[in-house]
């Protein structure tokens, strides 16, 4: 969470951003809020990116003003116009790419004053893992697959019964480059699996952490997976 205050001149206003992560090949959100104003026409929102000459996005007098927008962001950005009046200056970014990573500034002017806050935006790829029993293997084996990750993550296996056990000797992880030559498919195999146990395949990089669980019993197989973005670092 980053809270910024205005500079000299008029009163300062509080602007708040949250460091966030974008999944390449999807739309992303850069979060920014500010002390609202009663008149939309008095609000100016400017998004800037460190190292980029033009603006990322500008919204003023109740509408987009894109004449100064940098070519790299042309056709890709939007604010939530109906939420600006309540203090939401968050930016929607279409088709996030690796090159969108960096430091952004959310700069606000209202009738109450000015304020700004920086935001660290990370980009990468992350996806939900799926754990299955590998029936083709000679021994009881689990296979954990996740289609898209970048940067290369770490993969760790854990089990409910053998808590704290190190499975690195009985697992094998491979990374296969996807066709767009950026993201990779993650495949991890765990050998010598015992019945009536819950196993977890944990995939993590500096952007996201995902876990795929599988419970294998004599009568059934239960699966569960979840993904968490590692984005709310305080500054």
């Amino acid at each position: 969470l980053i809270i910024g205050f205005g500079i000299s001149g008029r009163h300062s206003i509080t602007v708040t951003t949250v460091a966030s992560a974008g999944n390449i090949g999807e739309d992303g959100i850069l979060s920014c809020t500010f002390e609202p104003d009663i008149k939309l026409s008095d609000i100016v929102i400017q998004w800037l990116k460190e190292g980029v000459l033009g603006l990322v996005h500008e919204f003023k007098e109740g509408k987009d003003e894109l004449s100064e927008q940098d070519e790299m962001f042309r056709g890709r950005t939007a604010v939530f116009a109906d939420q600006v009046i309540v203090g939401n200056a968050s930016l929607r970014l279409k088709n996030v790419q690796l090159t969108d990573a960096g430091t952004y500034k959310c700069y606000i002017i209202t009738s109450k004053g000015k304020g700004n806050a920086n935001l660290e935006y990370k980009t990468g790829a992350f996806s939900m893992p799926e754990v299955n029993v590998d029936y083709n293997a000679s021994s009881e084996t689990l296979r954990c697959e996740a289609p898209r990750w970048f940067p290369q993550p770490t993969v760790v296996w854990a089990s409910q019964v053998d808590q704290g056990a190190n499975f690195s000797e009985v697992s094998n992880t491979s990374f296969e480059l996807n066709s767009e030559n950026v993201t990779m498919k993650v495949v991890s195999v765990l050998y010598n699996v015992t019945i009536n146990n819950t196993y977890s395949c944990m995939i993590e990089n500096d952007i996201a952490k995902a876990t795929g669980d599988i419970k294998v019993t004599e009568s059934e197989i239960k699966r569960r997976s979840h993904l968490q973005l590692l984005n709310s670092k305080a500054s």
Partner: antibody, heavy 116, light 109 residues
Framework: EVQLVESGGGLIQPGGSLRLSCAAS????????MNWVRQAPGKGLEWVSV???????DSADSVKGRFTISRDNSKNTLYLQMNSLRAEDTAVYYC??????????WGQGTTVTVSS | EIVLTQSPGTLSLSPGERATLSCRAS???????LAWYQQKPGQAPRLLIY???SRATGIPDRFSGSGSGTDFTLTISRLEPEDFAVYYC??????????FGQGTKLEIK
């Protein structure tokens, strides 16, 4: 040259299935948002489905649960699997690339006719 | 759901005249996500304008786009015979993800 070529259209009975293909050349399908857009005879354009660069998909309510968009990265090809077809699905189906600033490349279209 | 309403439905003009086509959204649309297309009979649509006002590659400068919020305009400054076609506006980013207007037919008077 950047190009999209659709195939797979034809005459099909109500309730039937059909798979449309869209072969791309000159660019990588998986780096773009790829769409299917249709146009019923004498009508306007209607968005059908999208597959994001990430592989996630979304579809119009009118086709949800019946149509599935997918891609084969190794073949650089987009697909539309159409099940439980209805008379109102009769249209020319276009695949189109969204290169961040609008649907800038379109195929020539393939005609799907649903009739008994 | 954002509805795009184009007017007029049909516009009858002569070559050399100026054409003004309107696209009105039922709620605010980001200028970045508003595009215009031209479609001729038997052909696929062609992107003309993106980001409400930027011309796509190879589009002549007689085509221009303007507007913001809920009101957008496509202007053809001086009509050429090849400009007579159907024109669609389109927005991105709401549900459904892509929405088209119903079209304006530009015909020769």
């Amino acid at each position: 040259e950047v190009q999209l070529v659709e195939s797979g259209g034809g005459l099909i009975q109500p309730g039937g299935s059909l798979r449309l293909s869209c072969a791309a050349s000159g660019f990588i399908v998986s780096r773009n948002y790829m769409n299917w857009v249709r146009q019923a005879p004498g009508k306007g354009l209607e968005w059908v489905s999208v597959i994001y660069g990430s592989g996630r998909t979304d579809s119009a309510d009118s086709v949800k649960g019946r149509f599935t968009i997918s891609r084969d990265n190794s073949k650089n090809t987009l697909y539309l699997q159409m099940n439980s077809l209805r008379a109102e699905d009769t249209a020319v189906y276009y695949c189109a690339r969204d290169a961040d600033y609008g649907l800038d490349v379109w195929g020539q279209g393939t005609t799907v006719t649903v009739s008994s | 759901e954002i509805v795009l309403t184009q007017s007029p439905g049909t516009l009858s003009l002569s070559p050399g005249e100026r054409a003004t086509l309107s696209c009105r959204a039922s709620q605010s649309v980001s200028s970045s996500y508003l595009a215009w297309y031209q479609q001729k009979p038997g052909q696929a649509p062609r992107l003309l304008i993106y980001g409400a006002s930027s011309r796509a590659t190879g589009i002549p400068d007689r085509f221009s786009g303007s507007g913001s919020g809920t009101d957008f305009t496509l202007t053809i400054s001086r009509l050429e015979p090849e400009d007579f076609a159907v024109y669609y506006c389109q927005q991105y980013g709401s549900s459904p993800l892509y929405t088209f207007g119903q079209g304006t037919k530009l015909e020769i008077k």
